[in-house]
Amino acid sequence: MMTGTIETTGNISAEKGGSIILQCHLSSTTAQVTQVNWEQQDQLLAICNADLGWHISPSFKDRVAPGPGLGLTLQSLTVNDTGEYFCIYHTYPDGTYTGRIFLEVLESSVAEHGARFQIP
């Protein structure tokens, strides 16, 4: 039975040129996390694997930094970064849990930053 839930930063906004932390947290399950994938629509951004550590997709290497924790930091934001981001938790024995974050990158300097989410 998949009892777990994913808490995410939800809908967030950030300024063009700035950076943002995408973070998810899996709770309410005894399942053990083996790997977390970060995806933007259908594009793989990064993988955090239990054995191999972090792998950032080559096309995002300059603008994506691993962490904090299982989260992901996006840097040098552009308006094209606006869209849906997914954290995909591969767990044993439950299987896959997916969380969704919507990021809006604003031209304006009055972008309201979503509350930063910290994994305990």
């Epitope: 005894t30 399942a31 694997n49 938790y89 591969h90 767990t91 044993y92 024995p93 439950d94």
Partner: antibody, heavy 119, light 109 residues
């Protein structure tokens, strides 16, 4: 390379207890769950449950609640299965296997430990 | 509890293709059952071949593949080798526990 090495065969009397070990190497022990599976003579494989090696929380299959205990020693990357109040029907080969969440399942297995319960 | 069924025995010629199946008494097998296939040769430890329906284990030859076929999980060996002669067990996940099949004895002859 990943290896799960189990302790040697045991012969016990009914009512006694036994504790068998499964020592892991070749990977970070606390990153993967550990399962216990048994095979009684002439019987099929039965999943006994698993233990979260990060939190230490065990999950037991219904049939194996009560006399069976999963524990860990993370300092030595070892998982343990203890069976109390042994019965003749506990005679079996007990296997540990690693639980992987990326393509869910059991990817590496120990060689098995034969436990014989006989008066 | 669900019953998981496998062919008791199958025979394949060297270089031939064989498909082992794994069915559930509860209905069609789906990806949520995370079908696993493990191999056991006499006197050797179990070897994980396939996890999560179609995920090949590390070091497992490409001739082994997993899929869903006609409501069952399937293990296909394409170009069978003499060393593939072994017992093959499937396991299916049912919400909170694994159930193993009775095993298929594969002979390469």
């Amino acid at each position: 390379q990943v290896q799960l090495v189990q302790s040697g065969a045991e012969v016990k009397k009914p009512g006694a207890s036994v504790k068998i070990s499964c020592k892991a190497s070749g990977y970070t022990f606390t990153n993967y769950g550990m399962n216990w599976v048994r095979q009684a003579p002439g019987q099929g494989l039965e999943w006994m449950g698993w233990i979260n090696t990060y939190t230490g929380e065990p999950t037991y299959a219904q049939k194996f609640q009560g006399r069976f205990t999963f524990t860990l020693d993370t300092s030595t990357s070892t998982a343990y299965l203890e069976i109390s109040s042994l019965r003749s029907e506990d005679t079996a080969v007990y296997y540990c296997s690693r639980g992987n969440g990326y393509y869910v399942g059991m990817d590496y297995w120990g060689q098995g430990t034969l436990v014989t319960v006989s008066s | 509890q669900a019953v998981v069924t496998q062919e008791p025995s199958l025979t394949v010629s060297p270089g031939g293709t064989v498909t082992l199946t794994c069915g559930s008494s509860t209905g069609a097998v789906t990806t949520s059952n995370h079908a696993n296939w493990v191999q056991q040769k006499p006197g050797q430890a179990f070897r994980g071949l396939i996890r999560g329906t179609n995920g090949r284990g590390s070091g497992v030859p490409a001739r082994f593949s997993g899929s869903l076929l006609g409501g069952k999980a399937a293990l296909t060996i394409s170009g069978a080798q003499p060393e593939d002669e072994a017992e093959y067990y499937c396991a299916l996940w049912f919400s909170n526990h694994w159930v193993f099949g009775g095993g298929t004895k594969l002979t390469v002859l």
